[in-house]
Interface confidence: low
């Protein structure tokens, strides 16, 4: 390590001193210091002499000594002070460029140590510090004002008491550069446009960056437009805005438009499409098949997507019947904007009842006209059934109804002793019928099946049981025959409650 | 503890000037960092900032009354003085003296009166 | 010079009460600002100062916040001896300047 004499760490002298330093090593060695008049150098083998026969208060600084040969790197330091009555201040630098969150030193180095007690950091014309703004001092450096922020981009003043008066240094002119994170961030607005020709379309391409060095344009089609720029700042951020007007469109201003903004960090680009058609339109779609079969109690809702320009002068969902004359509650109906031209309207129908089922249609309406489209509810009803002991054409016959949706099928047993369910041990006998006679199928009710059993003698001991069942459950119905007659036996429970 | 006491004429005529002395105690405007300012309020109105005098010798004025103002302080005395010139009707006000309390390095030596004299009413008729 | 515009001019208030007053600069002045009670006849007292340090000695009911060109005085639970003209004082930059004082009356 190369050694410095005088030995050392600060030296005090009067301005018009003369100082020589001296700095000895193993090999050849180098001063390092603050740029300075009057300084004179001799080196000679493994000393090196730095000096000057008329210090100034420009003079004062550390002054560091190495052996480039030494694969330590070690060096060996000085802090010369030349304390000036009239100048307590040695500014390095009269600017200092720093990255936000990055200390930044103001290098006014005291040229007197005496006076460390009474150094301020001021902003110039008297102004204080911004509050939070944390510094530090070192005479040998000076002020740092540490992890700088872009509002600290200022002019500062190093302060020290001087005989009773507060002595200022030039000004220091800090500036503190944001960060650029990446590319601009950009907005084009709208996502999307749709005009009929003729109309007027505006679109709006935007660029923003901490930095003010950024480039943004608007290309159609990869063809660069050139279109006036409004600059502003706002928010700590500069922003550039090009806005395309167009007074009456036409099919050639269709497609595509990008927004690309770039900077050091690299490019962004963001684009929209433009359709120009040559009049109104309204579609209704739906990703639902219109026909719906739903378990009655059950809920439901009903999706339609409408894509329109102009927007919707109206809409609304109606009842078309056949039960009854209620319309859908205004409250179940729910509209959302998927963006400007597509919109998805929902009708919410929770715990049908049976008097619901039906037609429902969706109406809307824009200059383009009205259209609508129609769902239809059906509802599932698990079987009801009913069995009578009649005669058909003299022959005793049991004859079994069975209502429910979808269409229920029926199956017959017999089974010994008297029960209101025929279980497996007891069966006897098991018919299935695979056509049952159908009563009634009209639209959105249920379907009404007849089912007859010829029985040539009841036996007493015996019960005759009808089972209708469907996708959505089953029923039946227990027929006992007694000596005076016969006696039936709904189920136990009561399988089905509208 | 902390005192400071404002003295001065009760009553001057318009175009004259105005002393008004703040003697204090408790604290020393050599103090690194330590002020003294001048504060007026007419009758039924607010505040105004007149004045101020640092440790150093530094001097502020009301732009509005510059021409018209000069702080001084005798730190041996432990006063300081405010003279008014050209006195008008509209001077008409209670006149506090306050303490600018000191910051100690590293934070900026500027701070608000955080003592108060207890004013003193001077008209102008 | 920077605007200091005090706003209520005076405001009724019950003991208890929750009480806002706002100052607002006409430029930005880095939080350099403090608050005063004053009571009729007598010299203000310093309430806050640097926006919203408390100086020694002031109940924690009074506080005070904002940036930039908005700051604001809060006294939590109003008690009758807080009953007073308040002013707010810049001083980022000279001119140091007050509000016009808001004037704290019993409901």
């Known amino acids: 390590i190369p050694v410095i004499e005088p030995s050392v760490p600060e030296l005090v002298v009067k301005p018009g001193a003369t100082v020589t330093l001296r700095c000895v090593g193993n090999g050849s060695v180098e001063w390092d210091g603050p740029p300075s008049p009057h300084w004179t150098l001799y080196s000679d083998g493994s000393s090196s002499i730095l000096s000057t026969n008329n210090a100034t208060f420009q003079n004062t600084g550390t002054y560091r000594c190495t052996e480039p040969g030494d694969p330590l790197g070690g060096s060996a330091a000085i802090h010369l002070y030349v304390k000036d009555p009239a100048r307590p201040w040695n500014v390095l630098a009269q600017e200092v460029v720093v990255f936000e969150d990055q200390d930044a030193l103001l290098p006014c180095l005291l040229t007197d140590p005496v006076l460390e007690a009474g150094v301020s950091l001021v902003r110039v014309r008297g102004r204080p510090l911004m509050r939070h703004t944390n510094y530090s001092f070192s005479p040998w450096h000076g002020f740092t004002i540490h992890r700088a922020k872009f509002i600290q981009s200022q002019d500062y003043q190093c302060s020290a008491l001087m005989g009773g008066r507060k002595v200022m240094s030039i000004s220091i002119r800090l500036k503190v550069q944001k960060v650029i994170p990446g590319p601009p961030a950009l907005t084009l607005v709208p996502a999307e446009l749709v005009r009929i020709r003729g109309e007027a379309a505006q679109i709006v391409c935007s660029a923003s960056s901490v930095d003010v060095n950024f480039d943004v344009f608007l290309q159609h089609n990869n063809t660069k437009l050139a279109i006036p720029q409004q600059s502003d700042f706002h928010n700590n951020r500069y922003q550039k805005v090009l806005t395309l007007n167009l007074d009456q469109v036409d099919f050639q201003h269709a497609g595509n438009y990008s927004c690309v903004a770039s900077n050091v960090q690299g490019k962004h680009s963001t684009s929209m499409f433009f359709r120009v058609v040559e009049s109104a339109y309204l579609n209704l779609s739906s990703e639902q098949n219109l026909i719906q079969e739903v378990t009655v109690g059950e809920g439901l809702n009903l999706k339609v997507m409408v894509e329109a320009y102009p927007g919707l002068q109206g809409f609304n969902w109606t009842y078309l019947g056949p039960f009854s004359d209620h319309q859908p509650e205004p409250k179940l109906a729910n509209a959302t904007t998927k963006d400007t031209y597509r919109h998805t309207f929902t009708l919410s129908l929770p715990r049908l009842k049976p008097s619901e089922a039906g037609r429902y249609s969706f109406l809307a309406r824009n200059p383009g006209g009205w259209r609508a489209l129609t769902f239809e509810l059906t509802l599932r009803y698990p079987p009801e059934v009913s069995v009578i002991w009649t005669f058909i054409n003299g022959s005793g016959t049991l004859l079994c109804a069975a209502s429910g949706y979808p269409q229920p099928n029926v199956t017959w047993l017999q089974c010994s002793g008297h029960t209101d369910r025929c279980d497996e041990a007891q069966v006897l006998q098991v018919w299935d019928d695979p056509y049952p006679e159908v009563l009634s199928q009209e639209p959105f009710h249920k379907v009404t099946v007849q089912s007859l059993l010829t029985v040539e003698t009841l036996e007493h001991n015996q019960t005759y049981e009808c089972r209708a069942h469907n996708s959505v459950g089953s029923g039946s119905w227990a027929f006992i025959p007694i000596s005076a007659g016969a006696h039936t036996h709904p189920p136990d429970e009561f399988l089905f409650t509208p | 503890e902390v005192t400071l006491k404002e003295s001065g004429p009760a009553l001057v005529k318009p175009t004259q000037t105005l002393t008004l002395t703040c003697t204090f105690s408790g604290f020393s405007l050599t103090t690194y960092g330590m002020g003294v300012g001048w504060i007026r309020q007419p009758p039924g109105k607010a505040l105004e900032w007149l004045a101020n005098i640092w440790w150093d010798d530094d001097k502020y004025y009301n732009p509005s009354l510059k021409n018209r103002l000069t702080i001084s302080k005798d730190t041996s005395k432990n006063q300081v003085v405010l003279t008014m010139t050209n006195m008008d009707p509209v001077d008409t006000a209670t006149y506090y003296c306050?303490?600018?309390?000191?910051?100690?390095?590293?934070?900026?030596?500027?701070?608000?009166?955080?003592?108060w004299g207890q004013g003193t009413m001077v008209t102008v008729s | 010079d920077i605007q200091m515009t005090q706003s209520p001019s005076s405001l009724s208030a019950s003991v208890g009460d929750r009480v806002t007053i706002t100052c607002l600069a006409s430029?930005?002045?880095?939080?350099?600002l403090a608050w005063y009670q004053q009571k009729p006849g007598k010299a203000p007292k310093l309430l806050i100062y640097y926006a919203s340090s408390l100086q020694d000695g002031v109940p924690s009911r009074f506080s005070g916040s904002g940036s930039g060109t908005d700051y604001t005085l809060t006294i939590s639970s109003l008690q009758p001896e807080d009953f007073a003209t308040y002013y707010c004082?810049?001083?980022?930059?000279?001119?140091?300047?007050f509000g016009g004082g808001t004037k704290v009356e019993i409901k």
């Open positions: 004082l810049q001083d980022s930059e000279y001119p140091w300047t």
């Open positions: 430029e930005d002045i880095y939080d350099n």
């Open positions: 306050a303490r600018i309390g000191p910051i100690k390095y590293p934070t900026a030596p500027y701070r608000y009166f955080d003592f």
